[in-house]
Interface confidence: low
């Protein structure tokens, strides 16, 4: 193969945003290979060299007037302005979760089982999904895949809960999503037949 | 306090491949990179283009001088080369798989560095090219890359896949596989 | 104060390799941000750069004559010398040497420039 | 190669103001500060402006520079006759300086 050396640049202009853009910070990070070598951050307010590697910049760049005006003003310049410009189908972007119940295996019931809450296809990523047992609350027993980002501006995540389903019993599965008002719900029934179609 | 939200230009070029990347991230998702050899924006999402712009000319322009500064920086780190950091790979599905109804492959591939890595699908063995698409390379909290490859797909009983990823890192491919599972009674359902 | 002074020889022939010193006093070349830098001047045209050396010794190069050119230093002796491969009569020019104060900064001070005539 | 390009002549009048123009790309101008040189004849170059608008110790303030996008000028106010020279401007592309043509200032009269 090709075992030539590498030799990696990575610059970095990050803007960060708390409430808003009522507080923003600033981050511009320069990497040589994967080392952090100089930065500005605007809650400091100049360059700083992060290794010595970044030196000659920090001093160099802090020298620049024009460099250093332009980078104390990039909260608003820059941050503030592509917050604005992006808004619109970022920050506000919302897609419906799909919720899909099912089990990860047929079993007879009263055989432990394993029930996947499936939500798929949202955004944004931030979530909530808890487990019912006619009507209670279940929280033990319940493993998560976490949050999985798909690439392509949609989350999904499945929640499973451990149980052994007895008949009668309705498990419910509820979902919360900035995409919706009031929570989603997936009943699943505990019956003795396989198919479990509504 | 945990920031809401974060935007990224993020930016690299790497020698001696001489390849160069130009993307906007938000929160972890691509809004935008630049195709370097057609020199135009491609929006992750085609409506993003209908709600802004960006001018591609400039990040060649920040791309030329990317090059300039890594040679530099080459210089003075006396050739010091990047240590190859293998990437971790999934394979997931897009949705929850149903017989015969439209799904999507994803191979994620995560933690690695340098941004070089070559993918292959595999349908029972055999290369698959058709109506598959990638992501460009997406950047890392600490500093190393991530990569999306999807494969649309009809999923059945017969088929068997397989993620192929090929890394200065890894001493030989790696291969990450997916098969239909046995059958569940059916799901219940919300939109 | 900052002086510069170019030396090196008024006449070459073409095909001889140039080598110019630029000697320097009222700073040092060890200092950060510091380079200093080579600019001609053929008669009656512009200026035009040739090659810089910094502080930690990285060299810089016009693209249309890296191939040709060489520039080191000599911190101790407060020296910097240009070699010019393959002369020609087009090199025939009064060459500067500058001080940059700056990692890309101005060239503040410049050296009187010495003329150089390719000739055979 | 001459990169950044300044018209060959402008002339003015003494007491006039003159300005001289110095047209480069995003990789130079762009992304980099602009110095200007004056070049009085038979003599070497001299730093007239730095990091665009900034004047060294002892040039006065009838010179001032000024930058926006991917162009520079040079403005000279209340023209005296010994302003007449050659006057360059300078920055950088990527990691080489690079010059424009020059412009040759005449003052009339």
């Known amino acids: 193969g090709d075992t030539r050396p590498r030799f990696l640049w990575q610059p970095k202009r990050e803007c960060h945003f708390f409430n808003g853009t009522e507080r923003v910070r600033f981050l511009d990070r320069y990497f040589y290979n994967q080392e952090e070598s100089v930065r500005f951050d605007s809650d400091v307010g100049e360059f700083r060299a992060v290794t010595e590697l970044g030196r000659p910049d920090a001093e160099y760049w802090n020298s620049q007037k024009d460099i250093l005006e332009q980078a104390r003003a990039a909260v608003d310049t820059y941050c503030r302005h592509n917050y604005g410009v992006g808004e619109s189908f970022t920050v506000q972007r919302r897609v419906q979760p799909k919720v899909t119940v099912y089990p990860s295996k047929t079993q007879p019931l009263q055989h432990h089982n394993l029930l996947v809450c499936s939500v798929s296809g949202f955004y944004p990523g931030s979530i909530e999904v808890r487990w019912f047992l006619n009507g209670q609350e279940e929280k033990a027993g319940m493993v998560s895949t976490g949050l999985i980002q798909n690439g392509d501006w949609t989350f999904q995540t499945l929640v499973m809960l451990e149980t052994v389903p007895r008949s009668g019993e309705v498990y419910t599965c509820q979902v919360e999503h900035p995409s919706v008002t009031s929570p989603l719900t997936v009943e699943w029934r505990a019956r003795s037949e396989s198919a479990q179609s509504k | 306090i945990k920031e809401e939200h974060v935007i990224i230009q993020a930016e690299f070029y790497l020698n001696p491949d001489q390849s160069g990347e130009f993307m906007f991230d938000f929160d972890g998702d691509e809004i935008f990179h630049v195709d370097m050899a057609k020199k135009e924006t491609v929006w992750r999402l085609e409506e993003f283009g209908r709600f802004a712009s960006f001018e591609a000319q400039g990040a060649l322009a920040n791309i030329a001088v990317d090059k300039a500064n890594l040679e530099i920086m080459t210089k003075r780190s006396n050739y010091t080369p990047i240590t190859n950091v293998p990437p971790e790979v999934t394979v997931l599905t897009n949705s929850p798989v149903e017989l015969r109804e439209p799904n999507v492959l994803i191979c994620f591939i995560d933690k690695f560095t340098p941004p070089v890595v070559n993918v292959t699908w595999l349908r029972n063995g055999k290369p698959v090219t058709t109506g598959v698409s990638e992501t460009v390379f997406l950047p890392r909290e600490d500093h190393l890359f991530r990569k999306f490859h999807y494969l649309p797909f009809l999923p059945s009983t017969e088929d068997v896949y397989d993620c192929r990823v090929e890394h200065w890192g890894l001493d030989e491919p790696l291969l990450k596989h997916w098969e239909f599972d046995a059958p569940s009674p059916l799901p219940e359902t919300t939109e | 104060q900052v002086q510069l002074k170019e030396s090196g020889p008024a006449l070459v022939k073409p095909t001889q390799t140039l080598t110019l010193t630029c000697t320097f006093s009222?700073?040092?070349?060890?200092?950060?941000?510091?380079?200093v830098g080579w600019i001609r001047q053929p008669p009656g045209k512009a200026l035009e750069w040739l090659a810089l050396?910094?502080?930690?010794?990285?060299?810089y190069y016009s693209t249309s004559l890296k191939t040709r050119l060489t520039i080191s230093k000599d911190t101790s002796k407060n020296q910097v010398v240009l070699t010019m491969t393959n002369m020609d009569p087009v090199d025939t020019a009064t060459y500067y040497c500058?001080?940059?104060?700056?990692?890309?900064?101005?060239?503040?001070?410049w050296g009187q420039g010495t003329l150089v005539t390719v000739s055979s | 190669d001459i990169v950044l390009t300044q018209p060959p002549s402008v002339s003015g009048a003494p007491g006039q103001r003159v300005t001289i123009s110095c047209s480069g790309s995003?990789?130079?101008?762009?992304?980099?500060?602009v110095q200007w040189y004056q070049q009085l004849p038979g003599t070497a170059p001299k730093l007239l402006i730095y990091?665009?608008?900034q004047r060294p110790s002892g040039v006065p303030d009838r010179f001032s520079g000024s930058k926006s996008g991917t162009s520079a000028s040079l403005a000279i106010t209340g023209l005296q006759s010994e302003d007449e020279a050659d006057y360059y401007c300078?920055?950088?592309?990527?990691?080489?300086?690079?010059f424009g043509g020059g412009t040759k200032l005449t003052v009339l009269g």
């Open positions: 300078q920055s950088y592309d990527l990691i080489r300086h690079v």
């Open positions: 995003e990789s130079n101008i762009g992304n980099n500060y």
């Open positions: 990091d665009n608008n």
């Open positions: 500058a001080r940059s104060p700056r990692y890309r900064g101005a060239f503040d001070y």
């Open positions: 050396i910094d502080w930690d010794d990285d060299k």
């Open positions: 009222g700073f040092s070349l060890s200092t950060s941000g510091v380079g």
